[in-house]
C-alpha cells in the first residue's frame, strides 16, 4: 500500500533530552517507514545540519536512519530534528542534547594502595599506588621523617623526604612503583604516594614494619 | 596555564617598608608552597622564605627574619611579602615562585620551583 | 647562608656540549638528588630546566641534561645555540633553598 511516512520504532524514540559527556559519541535515530520509501534529513535548532557544520563532521546513516556525531563539544548542545517525508506526508521528532563538560578534578587514587608492608631486614619491598588523572598528573612518594624529635613542623604539616618525582624519562609505571632495596631498621616508617596536577594533590600512605 | 603576576615597581626612602603582591591563576593557590626570592642588580638569586598558603605557616631566611612578613588572602589567591626597614642594599627585583611541594606536608629534603613570576623592581634610594 | 659553588663563566661554539658544575656538600648535592637548575636571561624571570638531579619539565628541550656525581652536579647543554646564552643556576632544597653564585653562558661567534 502507499502511504505516508510513520515511525517504526516509536518505543526507541521515547528519550527527547540526551545529556552526555562531552568526547563522547552521540546517536539520534528516526526510524520509519512509508511507500514510497520516504528520505530523512536533519535540522539543528531548527535550520538544515549539515557535516561542514561541526568540526569533525557528522555520519549520516539514511538505512539506519540515524545522525552519528563523534567527540561532541559544548558547540554541539542544540535541538537536532529528523524530517522523514514522501510525497502523501511529512512527520518529524525533536531530540535535545546537552553536552556535559567534564568538571576537572584532583587526580584519584586507587583504594587499598600503597598497602602496608611488612619485610625482614635486608629484604627488597615496592610499594604501589595507582593515580587516575585528566589533567597529566605528576607523582612523588615521600617518606615522613622526624626532625629534633618531632613529626611535623610548627603548623601542624607532617616533615617529609621526597623519594621520587615523576620525571619526563619516567614511564607511568615506573612511578606507579617505590621500590626499597635491602631494608634497614631506618627504612621503616610511613611512605605517601601524592600525586598532583592543576587543580589539587591527593594522597595515600602506607606503613614498612621491618622485622629482625 | 600556570601564571603568577606581580604588582608592580616601587620606589622607597630608607627606613621605610614595601609590600609586594603575587597573584596566581590557573592551579589552586592553596596546594602549593609559594617561595619569595630576590635579586640585586648584576647578582645572583637570593632565597627570602616560603608561606604554606593552606596553613599559612611560613618559614623565613636567616638574614631577613624579623624584617620580612609573609602573608596570604586565600579569597583572591594572592601571596604577600613585606620587608620593612629597608636600606639601599635592599634594592632587587623581588620574585613570587610555585615550590612544587604540596601544602599538606613539610618539605625537609627534594622538591624544587617550577613557575616564577615576572618579578617587581623595589628601589631604595633617598 | 651556606651556597652552592658555581664557576663564574663558561663559553662555547654554537653546536658544541659545554658543562657547568655545582659543588656542595654531603649534606646537600652529595646526599640527596635534589638539585635543579634553572635559565635566566637579561630581564626576565628564571625558567626550570632540570629538577631532581636530571628530570627535565614538559617543554624543555633534550639538549639539556643534568648528573651528578660525589658533591657535584652538573648541567649538559649539548649542540650549543645562541639562545642558550643566560645566566645558569644551581639550587638544592634543604629545608631552605640554596641558590649557586650563577653562571654565565656565552656562545661565541
Known amino acids: 500500500d502507499t502511504g505516508a511516512p510513520y515511525w517504526t520504532r516509536p518505543e526507541r524514540m521515547d528519550k527527547k533530552l540526551l545529556a552526555v559527556p562531552a568526547a563522547n559519541t552521540v546517536r539520534f535515530r528516526c526510524p520509519a517507514a512509508g511507500n514510497p520509501t520516504p528520505s530523512i534529513s536533519w535540522l539543528k535548532n531548527g535550520r538544515e545540519f549539515r557535516g561542514e557544520h561541526r568540526i569533525g563532521g557528522i555520519k549520516l546513516r539514511h538505512q539506519q536512519w540515524s545522525l552519528v556525531m563523534e567527540s561532541v563539544v559544548p558547540s554541539d548542545r542544540g535541538n537536532y530534528t529528523c524530517v522523514v517525508e514522501n510525497k502523501f506526508g511529512s512527520i518529524r521528532q525533536t531530540y535535545t542534547l546537552d553536552v556535559l563538560e567534564r568538571s576537572p578534578h584532583r587526580p584519584i587514587l586507587q583504594a587499598g594502595l600503597p598497602a602496608n608492608q611488612t619485610a625482614v631486614l635486608g629484604s627488597d619491598v615496592e610499594f604501589h599506588c595507582k593515580v587516575y588523572s585528566d589533567a597529566q598528573p605528576h607523582i612523588q612518594w615521600l617518606k615522613h621523617v622526624e626532625v629534633n624529635g618531632s613529626k611535623v613542623g610548627p603548623d601542624g604539616t607532617p616533615y617529609v623526604t621526597v623519594l621520587k618525582t615523576a620525571g619526563a624519562n619516567t614511564t607511568d609505571k615506573e612511578l606507579e612503583v617505590l621500590s626499597l632495596h635491602n631494608v634497614t631498621f631506618e627504612d621503616a616508617g610511613e611512605y605517601t604516594c601524592l600525586a598532583g596536577n592543576s587543580i589539587g594533590f591527593s594522597h595515600h600512605s602506607a606503613w614498612l614494619v621491618v622485622l629482625p | 596555564q600556570v601564571q603568577l603576576v606581580q604588582s608592580g615597581a616601587e620606589v622607597k626612602k630608607p627606613g621605610a617598608s614595601v609590600k609586594v603582591s603575587c597573584k596566581a591563576s590557573g592551579y589552586t593557590f592553596t596546594s602549593y608552597y609559594m617561595h619569595w626570592v630576590r635579586q640585586a642588580p648584576g647578582q645572583g638569586l637570593e632565597w627570602m622564605g616560603w608561606?604554606?598558603?593552606?596553613?599559612?605557616?611560613?618559614n623565613y631566611a636567616q638574614k631577613f627574619q624579623g624584617r620580612v612578613t609573609m602573608t596570604r588572602d586565600t579569597s583572591i589567591s594572592t601571596a604577600y611579602m613585606e620587608l620593612s626597614s629597608l636600606r639601599s642594599e635592599d634594592t632587587a627585583v623581588y620574585y613570587c615562585?610555585?615550590?612544587?611541594?604540596?601544602?599538606?606536608?613539610?618539605?625537609?629534603?627534594?622538591?624544587?620551583?617550577?613557575?616564577w613570576g615576572q618579578g617587581t623592581l623595589v628601589t631604595v634610594s633617598s | 647562608d651556606i651556597a652552592l659553588t658555581q664557576p663564574a663563566s663558561v663559553s662555547g661554539s654554537p653546536g658544541q656540549s659545554i658543562t657547568i658544575s655545582c659543588t656542595g656538600t654531603s649534606s646537600d648535592v652529595g646526599g640527596y638528588n635534589y638539585v635543579s637548575w634553572y635559565q635566566q636571561h637579561p630581564g626576565k624571570a628564571p625558567k626550570l630546566m632540570i629538577y631532581d638531579v636530571s628530570n627535565r619539565p614538559s617543554g624543555v628541550s633534550n639538549r639539556f641534561s643534568g648528573s651528578k656525581s660525589g658533591n657535584t652536579a652538573s648541567l649538559t647543554i649539548s649542540g650549543l645555540q645562541a639562545e642558550d646564552e643566560a645566566d645558569y643556576y644551581c639550587?638544592?632544597?634543604?629545608?631552605?633553598?640554596?641558590f649557586g653564585g650563577g653562571t654565565k653562558l656565552t656562545v661565541l661567534g
Open positions: 608561606i604554606n598558603p593552606n596553613s599559612g605557616g611560613t
Open positions: 639550587q638544592s632544597h634543604h629545608f631552605y633553598e640554596v
Open positions: 615562585a610555585r615550590y612544587y611541594g604540596s601544602s599538606l606536608y613539610h618539605y625537609v629534603f627534594g622538591g624544587f620551583i617550577d613557575y
